[in-house]
Structure formats: structure tokens, C-alpha cells
């Protein structure tokens, strides 16, 4: 289109900018290392550094990662953005008594006004609930109509706090004891895992849970557990790590109680396809080190075509390891050197040669 | 912490062609190996091509015969031409660095640049 050419001939002379033929427009090229959030940019705003999931852009420019609701005491109030962290309050029926930055350290359960006193304000996710003295008339074993209903699904059956005189203290806080951490839970209608048979109410018997621990007194750090190779996800969920069983791959990260196993491939070998925490195909690695490359005398020097061996076999060289040195042995297998975290090494069957061409066939 | 820089992403027709540059200044170009991988929307990071310093290529089964990758080490720069396109190929087109040592996870997109977008539709 001639029309278009001054303004393609604008950018070309503004190395600010370029010319999108697509768009048909002069596009801001965002700075090295920042993302564009539209196809076409007009100005720096348009730009922005991409973190990677689960991490956000702070004020200072950093990929800072965002909190982690994954307490059971704690509930997702705001989910994790490009520009800001996830933030985490106590779920219903618990105040915060320590905060923390984006969430809370310490979760309590909200009081219930013991006899004689009624709720002046009921407890939020921030604040424990305020008592104050009951009007004359009203039965004392009733004192509230709090607390004379049945507990729902977001209160917890729970012994009444010490008496506080008023003149002291308006209100009262009561720490989460062992002793009736499986009644609370049960109570407050935990979400399990969609493929776990049993609830909450049966924790013995639950494959993805195992029986939660007492909690030190007054601690609110209590979180559910999960059976082993299982993780804690982000909604709460027993969920089970990765396996990394496949012969061709190897543990990079090991199953901790919040977050998966993580697999890789093994020394040697690429990822040709990823999946979540792990690689869905690993080849072996295509192209040999310069040095140690075996081909046919008449094969060209330049724009030689690798293709990968079939899956479990080596191409047939000697991969020169990251420091340099010989292989520790190269029949009837090859010795790869592990990367630099592990120092160990690694027999590679060498069944069949890499198919060499000139052509890409 | 090093820094890729891809471009040449666009709209194209079915059998159109494209051609995609990686560029970066933060490290000695004539040493690793340079790839190319791509993550269409809701699939895994999947591996396109390999490029090794001296000029050896590899092309995954999917895109050879129409893809070719190329270095200019002189300009820190590796290149993809990609001719023939489909509408399978449409993805985030992302180059990586040195993959024999980096890319043994599923973790090679997005992990220096941010990548360029291919469109491939009528």
C-alpha cells in the first residue's frame, strides 16, 4: 500500500519504533527484557516486565512472588495479578492477631460472648468480636442470639473464653487448642480434594489427609497435612506430586508439603514437550559437541540437519562435558557428566547412531 | 541475568511466511547452543529448533522442511524463517539459551524473553 509507506518510513527512521505490517501503524518497541500488553504499543505504559505464574511485578520493577494462601486457616481474598501479590485473610470464624505483609501469621478463632455479655460487633476477618454487657432482663444462659443458635457453617463450637471484666478488656480471643482442632474442622465444612473419598469429618481414613497434629498452644500455624507424596495446592486441596518415575527423567525439586515434585529430563536429554512441573517427552539431545561430533567424510562442514535418535538412544558421539574432560568411559555405554549441582555420572545406553543428512531427511 | 529479545511476530495467512530475530548483548554469542521453542495457547512449551554455535541444526518432526534456523554471531543475533505457515503453528515463539544445559525441564518459554506472537489464520 503506497499510502502507508511515509508512515513506515517514519519508524524506520525513529529507533524507538517500528512498523507493524499487520497493524498498519508506527508501534512503540518496548525496551529490552519488557512485554507488550497490546499488539501494538503506543507508549512506554503499554509495556511491562512479564514474571513468570504465580509471581508479580512489585513497585520496585522486581518478579516478587506472591503470597501463598494454602494455611487452612487462611482464604484467598484477592487472587495474584501481574501487579500485584495475592493477598490472604483468615477464613470465616478466625480474626487475625499477627499480620503479616499481603496476609496474616496467625489466625484465632472468634470469641463467643461468655454469660452475661452480648456482641457489641461481630468478629471479622480483621478483628475479634467485641462483647459488651448484657440489657437487664435477658436470660443469662442466653445471653446473646448468637449464642443461643446452632453453629453454622461459618461459626465454631468452641468452649467460652475466661470471663474478661470490661473495665480490662471488651473483648476476648481464644487460641486454637489440639484438643478440638478435628471438631473445628469438621465444623467449618472443609473443601477436600474432588477425587478424595472420605470428608473431613473422617480424617483416619483419608488417603490424600492424614490426621492434623495438635497445635502448640495459642499457635495459629496449624495447617492441614497431607499424606505423603501428596502437596497442599493453593485452594486448599491434598493433591498429588508428580511422579518422576518415567526412566527418562530425573527429581529436580523433591514433593514438600506446598508445592509439587518437580521433574526434568536427564543429563543428555531435552524437553520436547513440557508439562505441568515436568517434561511430557524428553528426546535425546540432537546436536553433538563440536569436538566430539562422528560423521561421514563427504558430509558437508556447515547447515548439516540433526535428527533425533529414537527416543532411549544417543546420538553417536562423545558429549564433551561442561568442564572439558574426557567421558569417564565410552563403550559399551557413554558416562554424560551430571550439571553442576549433582556430581555424579550418568550411563547412557548408545544403541543406535544418529542419522546424518545434508538434506533434513 | 541474561536477556533474549525476540521479534518479527505478526498475522499471517496460511502459507505465508515470517521471519523471527533473537537478539541479545549480555553474553559471548559464539558459545552456546540457541533454540527455539513455542507455547501455543493452553498447550505445553514445545522445542521447534536447535542451532549450535558452528552452524549444525536440528528441526523438531512438526516444522521441518518449512522452518529454518540461522545465526549471525557477529550480531548476537539467531534467526527463524518460517515459510509455509499453518494454523497449528500459531503460538508464543520464544529462543532460549544454551538448552543442552537449560532446557532439560518444560520451563524453556518465557525464561529470558518475552516473546513474540504468531498468528496464523484467514
Known amino acids: 500500500f503506497p499510502q502507508d509507506r511515509p508512515f513506515e518510513d517514519t519508524c524506520h527512521g525513529n529507533p524507538s519504533h517500528y512498523y507493524d505490517k499487520a497493524v498498519r501503524r508506527c508501534c512503540y518497541r518496548c525496551p529490552m527484557g519488557l512485554f507488550p500488553t497490546q499488539q501494538c504499543p503506543q507508549r512506554p505504559t503499554d509495556c511491562r516486565k512479564q514474571c513468570e505464574p504465580d509471581y508479580y511485578l512489585d513497585e520496585a520493577d522486581r518478579c516478587t512472588a506472591c503470597v501463598t494462601c494454602s494455611r487452612d486457616d487462611l482464604v484467598e481474598k484477592t487472587p495474584c495479578a501481574w501487579n500485584s501479590s495475592r493477598v490472604c485473610e483468615c477464613r470465616p470464624g478466625m480474626f487475625c492477631s499477627t499480620s503479616a505483609v499481603n496476609s496474616c501469621a496467625r489466625c484465632f478463632f472468634h470469641s463467643v460472648c461468655p454469660a452475661g455479655m452480648i456482641v457489641k460487633f461481630p468478629g471479622t476477618a480483621q478483628k475479634n468480636t467485641v462483647c459488651e454487657p448484657a440489657s437487664p432482663g435477658v436470660s443469662p444462659a442466653c445471653a446473646s442470639p448468637e449464642n443461643c443458635k446452632e453453629p453454622s457453617s461459618g461459626t465454631i463450637p468452641q468452649a467460652k473464653p475466661t470471663p474478661v471484666s470490661p473495665a480490662t478488656s471488651s473483648a476476648s480471643t481464644m487460641p486454637v487448642r489440639g484438643g478440638t482442632r478435628l471438631a473445628q474442622e469438621a465444623a467449618s465444612k472443609l473443601t477436600r480434594a474432588p477425587d478424595s473419598p472420605s470428608s473431613v469429618g473422617r480424617p483416619s481414613s483419608d488417603p490424600g489427609l492424614s490426621p492434623t497434629q495438635p497445635c502448640p498452644e495459642g499457635s495459629g500455624d496449624c495447617r492441614k497435612q497431607c499424606e505423603p507424596d501428596y502437596y497442599l495446592d493453593e485452594a486448599g486441596r491434598c493433591t498429588a506430586c508428580v511422579s518422576c518415575s518415567r526412566d527418562d527423567l530425573v527429581e529436580k525439586t523433591p514433593c514438600a508439603w506446598n508445592s509439587s515434585r518437580t521433574c526434568e529430563c536427564r543429563p543428555g536429554m531435552i524437553c520436547a514437550t513440557s508439562a505441568t512441573n515436568s517434561c511430557a517427552r524428553c528426546v535425546p539431545y540432537p546436536i553433538c559437541a563440536a569436538e566430539t561430533v562422528t560423521k561421514p567424510q563427504d558430509m558437508a562442514e556447515k547447515d548439516t540437519t540433526f535428527e533425533a535418535p529414537p527416543l532411549g538412544t544417543q546420538p553417536d558421539c562423545n558429549p564433551t562435558p561442561e568442564n572439558g574432560e574426557a567421558p569417564a568411559s565410552t563403550s559399551p555405554t557413554q558416562s554424560l557428566l551430571v550439571d553442576s549441582q549433582a556430581s555424579k555420572t550418568l550411563p547412557i545406553p548408545t544403541s543406535a547412531p544418529v542419522a546424518l543428512s545434508s538434506t533434513g531427511k | 541475568e541474561v536477556q533474549l529479545v525476540e521479534s518479527g511476530g505478526g498475522l499471517v495467512q496460511p502459507g505465508g511466511s515470517l521471519r523471527l530475530s533473537c537478539a541479545t548483548s549480555?553474553?559471548?554469542?559464539?558459545?552456546?547452543?540457541m533454540a527455539w521453542y513455542r507455547q501455543a495457547p493452553g498447550k505445553g512449551c514445545e522445542l521447534v529448533s536447535i542451532i549450535s554455535a558452528d552452524g549444525r541444526t536440528y528441526y523438531a518432526d512438526s516444522v521441518k522442511g518449512r522452518f529454518t534456523i540461522s545465526r549471525d554471531n557477529a550480531k548476537n543475533t539467531v534467526y527463524l524463517q518460517m515459510n509455509s505457515l499453518r494454523p497449528e503453528d500459531t503460538a508464543v515463539y520464544y529462543c532460549?539459551?544454551?538448552?543442552?544445559?537449560?532446557?532439560?525441564?518444560?520451563?524453556?518459554?518465557?525464561?529470558w524473553g518475552q516473546g513474540t506472537l504468531v498468528t496464523v489464520s484467514s
Open positions: 549480555a553474553f559471548t554469542f559464539d558459545g552456546p547452543d
Open positions: 532460549a539459551l544454551d538448552p543442552r544445559k537449560n532446557c532439560r525441564g518444560g520451563y524453556c518459554c518465557a525464561n
